[in-house]
């Protein structure tokens, strides 16, 4: 572990500061981590990391002159599970062929860059659950259809918050098993079109806080368990509750919206077919009793990723066999915002 210009320890290489003007061609191919921090790299050239068969992590951070990432930079790296590209405000272009064949990828971060389009992830083909973390890229305005096809054969978490997203096309999430979608803090985002989740499974968690979204799509929310819409002042109405059959937790803007969940009963037709099997009824009742108050989904500040992808909700949820739905909703109605004002006693009864 020795290099003329990069620091290293135990096969981790740190290429740091202004003396680093290009990716050194003589970095040992058995490196397990590469970090490029505060450098003067302008271009990351095609094939810069080819042959790094043991490479697990790449970090490219605080590189203020970086402009371009060429094709085949992150390609054919069998052990690579983490890529971080952050604080590169002059990074305007990532070649569509930059990310290819990364079977172990679990985390891809692109934040605080100048890119205008989402990176092309169609050829990543990860065999792992992937967290795609694309934040603080104020020049990304659109999410095109099929934007995440080919990212992973497993489920994905998409953190797309704090970008400049203004428009999301129908079928944007086609082909994904969407565990979590975070669109918060895209202040100019006004619409989630009706078919935005067409071809997708999920989302299970959806965060649209601090956007201008005025309505949720009519389709694709069947698996939604947790909805966050804090400070989403344009969201004046929710879909009919029949569209939110799995919802268990809602964190909303207006207390009045929580009134909708008071004494909500699922129609028998909405229950999962397994619930009708009489052999299972006793077991289901016992299990739901024993579990009592279910463990809450990921805390607001804790991602499913940080808990090691402990996605318990992918198993069958016997609570869905309860007719009475206990949705945890906030902000709760109170003396100043009583449900009676908007719903009336008759409906509540």
């Amino acid at each position: 572990c020795h290099h003329r210009i990069c620091h290293c320890s135990n096969r981790v290489f740190l290429c740091q500061e202004s003396k680093v003007t290009e990716i050194p061609s003589d970095l040992p191919r058995n490196a397990i981590e590469l970090r490029f921090v505060l450098t003067k790299l302008r271009v990351i050239q095609k094939g810069a990391f080819s042959g790094f068969g043991d490479l697990e992590k790449i970090e490219i951070s605080q590189n203020d002159v970086l402009e371009v990432i060429e094709a085949d930079v992150f390609s054919n790296l069998p052990k690579l599970h983490e890529i971080r590209i952050e604080k590169a405000n002059n990074l305007l272009y990532i070649n569509p062929e930059a990310f290819q064949n990364l079977p172990n990828l679990q985390y891809l971060l692109i934040s605080n860059t100048g890119i205008k389009h989402l990176p092309d992830v169609h050829k990543i083909h990860s065999l792992q659950k992937v967290l795609l973390d694309i934040q603080d890229n104020i020049n990304i305005h659109t999410i095109e259809r099929n934007s995440f096809v080919g990212l992973s054969f497993e489920s994905v978490i998409l953190w797309l918050n704090k970008n400049g997203i203004q428009e999301i096309h129908n079928c944007a999430f086609n082909g994904t098993q969407l565990d979590e979608l975070n669109l918060s803090d895209n202040n100019n985002l006004e619409e989630l079109p009706n078919d935005v989740f067409h071809g997708a499974s999920g989302p299970v968690i959806l965060d649209i806080s601090r956007t201008r979204i005025h309505s949720l799509p009519s389709y694709g929310l069947e698996n939604l368990k947790k909805l966050r819409a804090r400070s989403t002042y344009n969201l004046k109405k929710l879909p009919t509750l029949e569209k939110l059959v799995a919802l268990m937790e809602a964190s909303l803007t207006y207390p009045s919206h929580c009134c909708a969940f008071a004494n909500w009963r699922r129609q028998i037709s909405e229950l999962h077919p397994i619930c009708n099997k009489s052999i299972l009824r006793q077991e289901v009742d016992y299990m739901t009793q024993a579990r009592g108050q279910r463990s809450s989904l990921a805390e607001d500040n804790e991602s499913s990723y940080s808990r090691g992808f402990d996605m318990t909700y992918t198993e069958f949820d016997y609570d869905l066999c309860n007719e009475v739905v206990d949705v945890t909703c906030s902000p709760k109605p109170d003396a100043f915002n009583p449900c009676e004002d908007i719903m009336g006693y008759n409906i509540l009864r």
Partner: antibody, heavy 120, light 111 residues
């Protein structure tokens, strides 16, 4: 085979200027990643880093002595120079020239040192 | 400045036994996952010689009985098994930030 050799006056009077020369072989200060520095050690005491210079002429000084230090190089003749102005008795020490690798800032090879005595 | 404090100041170890020297930094010497902490050996009348760099990486040609460990602010140098030739002064040194500084040294002798 890397070799470094220090040369200096041996004895100086207080307030005089110390001029040290490091002559080296086995590497070039024109090669990226290479640096040469100076470290001193008073007899029977610890080590003090003074200054170093990189291949690209980037220089770093110990802030406690910066106002008195000047480091320079002549890459073509494989030499590095250190000037210490206004010496005092506390500058009495063995002065080592060191080859530094930018990777890990490693003090890879040391000269045998030259002794300076400051006495009136 | 980052102050490095070595302990003990001196140490007597039997041949074949383990010598452990500690080096504590006044603040972390880690940067982006790498510890900028080196260990040197100095014998009387000779310049120091690099043994360990980046806390735990052995310089080529250094015997395997020398090993380093630690991160952040706490580091140690181990010599095992102790040999006659290992009688010397040992210094830790940080190069995380200028001014690069050295510990006060530990004198290791044979008991």
């Amino acid at each position: 085979q890397v070799n470094l050799k220090e040369s200096g006056p041996g004895i100086l009077q207080p307030s005089q200027t110390l001029n040290l020369t490091c002559s080296f072989s086995g590497f070039s200060l024109s090669t990226s990643g290479m640096g040469v520095g100076w470290i001193r050690q008073p007899s029977g005491k610890g080590l003090d880093w003074l200054a170093h210079i990189w291949w690209d002429d980037d220089k770093r000084y110990n802030p406690a002595l910066k106002s008195r230090l000047t480091i320079s190089k002549d890459a073509s003749s494989n030499q590095v120079f250190l000037k210490i102005a206004s010496v005092v008795t506390a500058d009495t020490a063995t002065y080592y020239c060191v080859q530094i690798n930018y990777g890990n800032y490693r003090f890879d090879n040391w000269g045998h040192g030259t002794t300076l005595t400051v006495s009136s | 400045d980052i102050v490095l404090t070595q302990s003990p100041a001196s140490l007597a170890v039997s041949l074949g036994q383990r010598a452990t020297i500690s080096c504590r930094a006044s603040e972390s010497v880690d940067n982006y996952g790498i510890s900028f902490l080196n260990w040197f050996q100095q014998k009387p009348g000779q310049p120091p010689k690099l043994l360990i760099y980046a806390a735990s990486n052995q310089r080529s040609g250094v015997p395997a009985r020398f090993s380093g460990s630690g991160s952040g602010t706490d580091f140690s140098l181990n010599i095992h098994p102790m040999e006659e030739d290992d009688t010397a002064m040992y210094f830790c040194q940080q190069s995380k930030e200028v001014p690069w500084t050295f510990g006060g040294g530990t004198k290791v002798e044979i008991k």
